[in-house]
């Protein structure tokens, strides 16, 4: 088999026939050096998954539940291409599983016990697996058999396809529990009708069901969605209020050596030649000898799944939680009203050491998880491996796009009511040496630049956003002669000035000596022409305040700020000479952890915050000798956000717009992955 062959896995005679036709038609339109198809027949999807894992096949298309099976060890497959539905302009690759209720019914998600439920069918995704999986740990014990536990949880149900003899309560709202459209309450529309008729109190369906069944907005307005945070939202706000976001149908491949680029090349060419309305003789999305052979008949095309996206991220935390609960049947022993330890995400072993000290002192309230980059930490919080971390505004933006929420803000000014008064923000500045007297904001081209890290506010988003508006392209590595912007591509000129050794060179963590505010300033001191930092950086590292050898003899007066009008000012005049105001760093978490993270962090700062006077003898949460480990060292307290509890509200319209403009220059693989899930 030549190297450019994709071995497609078929699960029936009809699929194998269509696969051979696919193979032959592709041969006729693709040059001999292009990708080709070979067909491998197996007895089931699970056999296909095993065959791909064993390198006996390369690809198969699966629904969400099987994508989960494919991801589990030892299979370790990953999503590589998604089918989309709808139009090319507005492609739909996911649907949302929702809980629909009548507007005047007055209960929340955590009050479903004793209510009457309408399901599309036993064992179906949106109608059963997702809601029951998410409710699993609230079901009365014993939880097996599952149908009995569900029957005892709700006061009555219609769950088509259930065994009405053994579990009559599941068929109480639709006698007989018929498993076809002969049962008026079967399927998506049936489950909604069960709610509409007043038989049930809640219907578990998908987001489009209500629109397909009620064309009139006034009628739709009589219904609401139950959200997982125990609030309600209008039915058109399903993107912010759903039980899970579920991929419709996905091509999977091996995680390592999985030919993902070749599979995409093949399918992209296939959709060009044999996609919707392309060819009479062979149609990719049509199954004359069956239904949904190889691909769904309703699909309109394919989209490449971003490479950063593993199955856990693709399926989403809620879906994975629901399916894992159903499959593994394990629930935490702690009462649900008690907070579990908060798993803090620490960057590299530097932060890990401080985090472990915090953990030991917290007596089990804090646990530590490590990752090498901020984006890896955000991904771990998304999938539940970690719970929280404090982030610069640029990463609050990415975390927000990935569904996380800000929960507390770092405050940097001492005030009587620190915890109740979130600040307006800090200033992003451009610092130069006083001796380089000809340097201004207008002649930075060809100079050597020092940045806190790619994607961070003061060090990157603000200065590069302003620069982009001037030069109208993203080739910042050509604008500056060289620099250190941790997180840049290793061969970029923006890694040339960095000081990390070996693999740590230009890494966006403390293993790179020029990382962060202090690191960027050190880069200016030792090698650079300009450093993009926060307004407190120079005073915090001069006048003997930083005892490190490189900093101990520095004088604030030897540095100046570049103003946007082309002038320069002394460092202390930052209020009249800065690039922009930056939102303070903030702690982010998943929505489901918001209350517990808030509660535990407020307790922790009362124990280890700024009220601790002797930090050499006692653990101090906000101190790490200018390294900004876990939190900025100038943090006075963590403040409540009040109503600024989404990333857009927290960062403010102006900053969100600025980062949005810079998105075309983004190298963030995580941002690409998250915007695939939510464009």
């Amino acid at each position: 088999v030549p190297d450019k062959t994709v071995r497609w896995c078929a699960v029936s005679e009809h699929e194998a026939t269509k696969c051979q036709s696919f193979r032959d038609h592709m041969k006729s339109v693709i040059p001999s050096d292009g990708p080709s198809v070979a067909c491998v027949k197996k007895a089931s999807y699970l056999d296909c998954i095993r065959a791909i894992a064993a390198n006996e096949a390369d690809a198969v298309t699966l629904d969400a539940g099987l994508v989960y099976d494919a991801y589990l060890a030892p299979n370790n497959l990953k999503p590589v291409v998604a089918e989309f539905y709808g139009s090319k302009e507005d492609p739909q690759t996911f649907y949302y599983a929702v809980a629909v209720v009548k507007k005047d019914s007055g209960f929340q998600m955590n009050q479903l016990r004793g209510k009457k439920s309408c399901h599309t069918g036993l064992g179906r995704s949106a109608g059963w697996n997702i809601p029951i999986g998410l409710l699993y740990c609230d079901l009365p014990e014993p939880r097996k058999p599952l149908e009995k536990a569900v029957a005892n949880f709700f006061s009555g149900s219609c769950a088509p396809c259930a065994d009405g003899t053994d579990f009559p309560q599941l068929c109480q709202l639709c006698p007989g529990c018929g498993c076809s459209t002969l049962n008026q309450y079967f399927g998506y529309s049936g489950a909604f009708k069960c709610l509409k008729d007043g038989a049930g109190d809640v219907a578990f369906v998908k987001h489009s069901t209500i629109f397909e069944n009620l064309a009139n907005k006034a009628d739709r307005d009589q219904y609401e969605l139950l959200c997982l945070d125990n609030t309600r939202k209008p039915v058109d706000e399903y993107k912010d209020c759903h039980l899970a976001q579920v991929p419709s149908h996905t091509v999977v491949a091996r995680s390592m050596g999985g030919k993902e680029d070749l599979i995409w090349e093949l399918l992209n060419q296939a959709q060009e030649h044999f996609g919707k309305d392309k060819s009479k003789e062979f149609q990719l999305f049509s199954s004359p000898h069956g239904k949904d052979l190889l691909f769904k008949d309703s699909a309109h095309g394919f989209l490449k799944v971003p490479p950063r996206m593993d199955a856990k991220m693709y399926l989403g935390y809620e879906y994975v939680t629901a399916i894992r609960n159903l499959r593994e049947g394990t629930c935490p022993e702690a009462p649900t009203d008690e907070c579990k330890p908060v798993k803090w995400c620490a960057l590299s072993h530097h932060e890990r050491l401080k985090c472990d000290e915090w953990s030991v002192n917290s007596v089990g309230k804090i646990e530590c998880v490590s990752a090498e980059t901020t984006e890896d930490c955000i991904a771990k919080i998304m999938n539940g491996e970690a719970d929280a971390m404090s982030l610069d505004g640029g990463f609050v933006y990415i975390a927000g796009k990935c569904g996380l929420v800000p929960v507390l803000a770092e405050n940097y000014n001492k005030s009587d009511n620190c915890e109740d008064t979130p600040e307006a923000g800090y200033f992003a500045i451009a610092v130069v040496k006083k001796s380089a007297s000809d340097l201004t904001w207008d002649n930075l081209k060809g100079k050597k630049s020092c940045h806190t890290a790619v994607g961070r506010t003061a060090g990157w988003n603000i200065p590069m956003g302003l620069l982009y508006n001037k030069i109208n392209h993203c080739r910042f590595d050509e604008f500056f002669s060289e620099g250190c912007a941790p997180g840049s591509k290793k061969d970029s000129s923006l890694c040339k000035l960095c000081m990390g050794s070996g693999l740590n060179l230009c890494e966006p963590n403390n293993k790179e000596g020029y990382y962060g505010y202090t690191g960027a300033f050190r880069c200016l001191v030792e090698k650079g022409d300009v450093a993009f930092v926060k307004h407190q950086t120079v005073p915090q590292n001069t006048g003997g305040k930083n005892p490190d050898p490189w900093a101990k003899n520095l004088n604030e007066k030897d540095y100046e700020l570049l103003c946007l009008d082309g002038t320069r000012k002394p460092v202390e005049e930052y209020a009249n000479c800065h690039l922009a105001r930056a939102p303070n760093h903030a702690v982010v978490t998943r929505k489901d952890k918001e209350a517990c993270v808030h509660k535990i962090l407020r307790q922790q700062q009362h124990l280890f915050g700024s009220n601790v006077t002797d930090c050499s003898g006692n653990f101090c949460l906000f101190r790490s000798e200018t390294k900004d480990l876990l939190f900025r060292d100038d943090t006075v307290c963590l403040a409540k956000l009040h109503d600024r509890n989404t990333y857009e509200k927290y960062l403010g319209e102006e900053y969100v717009k600025a980062v949005g403009n810079l998105r075309k220059c983004s190298t963030s693989s995580l941002l690409e992955a998250c915007t695939f899930r939510r464009p």
């Epitope: 000290e357 101090c620 000798e625």
Partner: nanobody
Framework: QVQLVESGGGLVQAGGSLRLSCAAS????????MAWYRQAPGNQRGLVAA???????RYADSVKGRFTISRDNAKNTMYLQMNSLKPEDTAVYYC????????WGQGIQVTVSS
């Protein structure tokens, strides 16, 4: 600046024992937190054992009952007594400490053969 130097590593048979030492020099402040970490190839560095200056001790679940951390403040030295060693204990072991700053040793290899 504080320097940390590990010693006592080496090759040992499964079921055997080793005692690692970590000597701190250059410290003008008490080291408030001292810990042992380990890193096996392809894995992240993980906490093995830690002790605060107040005497609170924590062990990783995988070493509880087999490893013991202790410190001799007079000698500015920390120890890790490792008993009933298993092949999965093979790793580079790092000594780490914190006062206001954080400090790391260079690491020392421990190999447990079966």
């Amino acid at each position: 600046q504080v320097q940390l130097v590990e010693s006592g590593g080496g090759l040992v048979q499964a079921g055997g024992s080793l005692r690692l030492s970590c000597a701190a020099s250059g410290s003008i402040r008490p080291l408030r937190f001292m810990a042992w970490y380990r890193q096996a190839p392809g894995n992240q560095r993980g906490l093995v054992a830690a002790e605060t200056s107040g005497g609170t001790i924590r062990y990783a679940d995988s070493v509880k009952g087999r490893f013991t951390i202790s410190r001799d403040n007079a000698k500015n030295t920390m120890y890790l007594q490792m008993n009933s060693l298993k092949p999965e204990d093979t790793a580079v072991y790092y000594c780490a400490a914190r006062d206001l700053d954080d400090y790391w040793g260079q690491g020392i290899q421990v190999t447990v053969s079966s």
